[in-house]
Interface confidence: medium
């Protein structure tokens, strides 16, 4: 847009630079992107809220990311479209600065959330024994809060108070942009902190995740399951827990309810959680079996993730408590990333022949785990997780790089950037918020099913969708 002024009064020619059909096209495209961003991120947030199986530490990070992306979809995209289409900023300097502060703080919070997720995955892969213990809801909350606070500190004061720092507001009436972008040092500093440093960190983390996954795949290829030692009774930790209804396995973290079929424990579907890598990144390394004997119906049995369960029939005694023998990976409640130690839990029964039943069940399961699997399926989950993290990283770089390169160019050669190129670059950053829900959520089967239920208004049993 070329805002020429006449020499007498410097009044601005505030008119739309676009023809009517161009305005319609821009509004349709921008409106559609805004709508998709809003719907996508609301779906992520509502899914996590309504489905208890999605209420995991990993998904708290996604919830925070969705919050940031939703704000971008609601406010940033639409206000920028208005500004672009009508050719000037109609809402005054105060709203301008508030919009810019919100825009940059939230966009940066989105980036910081991506960074947190990368760190989380990195620690899951590189510290599988120590990190899950620390990976609590409280810690996740602190990390999320840090992301938002850091983003606020980085952008809000500079945007809101720069005019007072330098003593003059140099932004024209009818325009809205960051005043300090004329200051090379500040521009370079914020660009490095908000984009270049996160990109470098995320790239390094991805490289480490990729390397760890590749080494694990190689290790798996070298050691076929047929040659692995079967689980022997002496290796299994037996723990008798006195009768108690509270000793039922928790369902909060359950991901896929797999039954033992024909005496074989089926593998988790490889497609499950391909992006999240949710706690299943290394589930190829172990198979976990949970046998539950109780007076519950088969479909009432709940289980921890990574477990395979079978009902051993109803107890004859009406008053008998459940007997639960659980062999497999014992992992912290807070949706840990990788298995830690193998346990057998025998949850006792107060009914007749309780001990006898426990012994039979224990023997049967130990016997079953002794049978070596004929062939291990290709470890494609690690590859998939690594591939998806790469996709997320590339999506972030592709959508954010053009704008951040232009910002630097602008400090020493503003006319070098055509208006349309700048606008597209600015919009690309917003599009990252449209892509994020698809990148993270749509590759998770539980998310997908919950989305489907929400969109089709099937609210019955939505809280237990796996």
């Amino acid at each position: 847009m070329n805002n020429s002024t006449n020499s007498s009064n410097n009044s601005l020619a505030l008119t739309s630079p676009y023809k009517t059909f161009e305005v319609v096209f821009i509004v349709l495209v921008a409106g559609s992107l805004s709508l998709v961003t809003i719907i996508g991120n609301i779906l992520v947030m509502v899914s996590i809220k309504v489905n208890r199986h999605l209420q995991t530490v990993n998904n708290y990070f996604l919830f925070s990311l969705a919050c940031a992306d939703l704000i971008i979809g609601v406010f940033s995209m639409n206000l920028y479209t208005l500004y672009t289409v009508i050719g000037y900023w109609p809402l005054g300097p105060v709203v301008c600065d508030l919009w810019l502060a919100l825009d940059y703080v939230v966009s940066n919070a989105s980036v910081m959330n991506l960074l947190i997720i990368s760190f989380d995955r990195y620690f899951c892969v590189t510290k599988p024994l120590t990190y899950p213990v620390k990976r609590t809801t409280k810690m996740a909350g602190m990390m999320i809060a840090a992301a938002w606070v850091l983003s606020f500190i980085l952008w809000a004061p500079a945007i809101l108070f720069w005019q007072f720092i330098v003593g003059v507001r140099t932004v024209e009436d009818g325009e809205c942009y960051i005043q300090f972008f004329s200051n090379a040092a500040v521009t370079f500093g914020t660009a490095i902190a908000a984009f270049y440093l996160p990109v470098i960190i995320m790239t390094v983390l991805y490289w480490h995740i990729s390397r760890a996954s590749k080494s694990r795949i190689k290790k798996d290829k070298k050691e076929p399951v047929a040659n692995q030692d079967p689980v022997s009774p002496s290796l299994v930790q037996g723990r008798i827990v006195k009768p108690n209804n509270n000793n039922m396995p928790s369902s909060d973290d359950g991901l896929e309810h797999n039954k033992i079929q024909n005496g074989k424990a089926p593998r988790d579907p490889v497609t499950e959680n391909c992006v999240q890598g949710e706690e299943k990144e290394s589930s190829n390394d172990s198979t976990s079996v949970s046998a539950v004997a109780s007076n519950m119906r088969d479909d009432e049995i709940t289980q921890d993730e990574n477990t395979v369960s079978t009902s051993l029939g109803h107890s004859k005694d009406e008053n008998s408590k459940q007997t639960c023998i659980r062999i497999g990976t014992k992992t912290p409640k807070s949706d840990s990333c990788t298995p830690t130690n193998t346990t057998v839990e025998v949850v006792g029964s107060s009914g007749q022949n309780g001990d006898e039943k426990q012994n039979i069940v224990a023997r049967k399961i130990v016997k079953m785990t002794k049978q070596p699997a004929k062939k291990k399926p290709p470890p494609s989950r690690e590859k998939k997780v690594t591939r998806t993290i790469l996709a997320i990283l590339l999506a972030f770089i592709i959508t954010w790089a053009p704008y951040n390169v232009m910002v630097l160019i602008n400090t020493f050669c503003a006319p070098c950037i055509p208006n349309t190129v700048w606008t597209i670059g600015y919009w690309l950053c917003y599009i990252n918020s449209t892509i994020n829900p698809a990148c993270y959520a749509l590759c998770n089967a539980t998310f997908k099913k919950t989305f489907k239920h929400l969109l089709m208004c099937h609210y019955k049993n939505i809280g237990a969708t796996r």
């Epitope: 070329n2 601005l12 140099t170 024209e172 972008f181 232009m406 503003a414 950037i417 700048w422 600015y426």
Partner: nanobody
Framework: QVQLQESGGGLVQPGGSLRLSCTAS?????????TTWYRQAPGKQRELVAV????????NYADSVKGRFTISRDDAKNTVYLQMNNLKPEDTAVYYC??????????????WGQGTQVTVSS
């Protein structure tokens, strides 16, 4: 808005010197402005005389004034200067100060002063 005020014009003999000043008020001429001196002789089109550009204070001059005129800028005083040496009668014109501000994704804003008369005559 930015108001530009020229000063320093007047009557001078051929071979003489003048220093024109262009002071910005309202908002500062920061490093995002390109500042230019134009001139317009009676009955002629406005022509570019000298530009003080964006990157690192680059300067450009019309062929007719090269070696005689010098453009400079003092950010502390929000002022752009045009030092005119070895003036010729054909330099007689009204001299205008112009500031161009590029706004990323928006384009340029042109700010003009009212002009100052320079007359070179013996």
């Amino acid at each position: 808005q930015v108001q530009l005020q020229e000063s320093g014009g007047g009557l001078v003999q051929p071979g003489g010197s003048l220093r024109l000043s262009c002071t910005a008020s309202g908002r500062s001429i920061s490093n995002i402005y390109a500042t230019t001196w134009y001139r317009q002789a009676p009955g002629k089109q406005r022509e570019l005389v000298a530009v003080f550009g964006y990157s690192g204070g680059t300067t450009n001059y019309a062929d007719s004034v090269k070696g005689r005129f010098t453009i400079s800028r003092d950010d502390a005083k929000n002022t752009v200067y045009l030092q005119m040496n070895n003036l010729k009668p054909e330099d007689t014109a009204v001299y205008y100060c112009n500031a161009v501000k590029y706004i990323p994704g928006r384009g340029e804003y042109d700010y003009w002063g009212q002009g100052t008369q320079v007359t070179v005559s013996s």
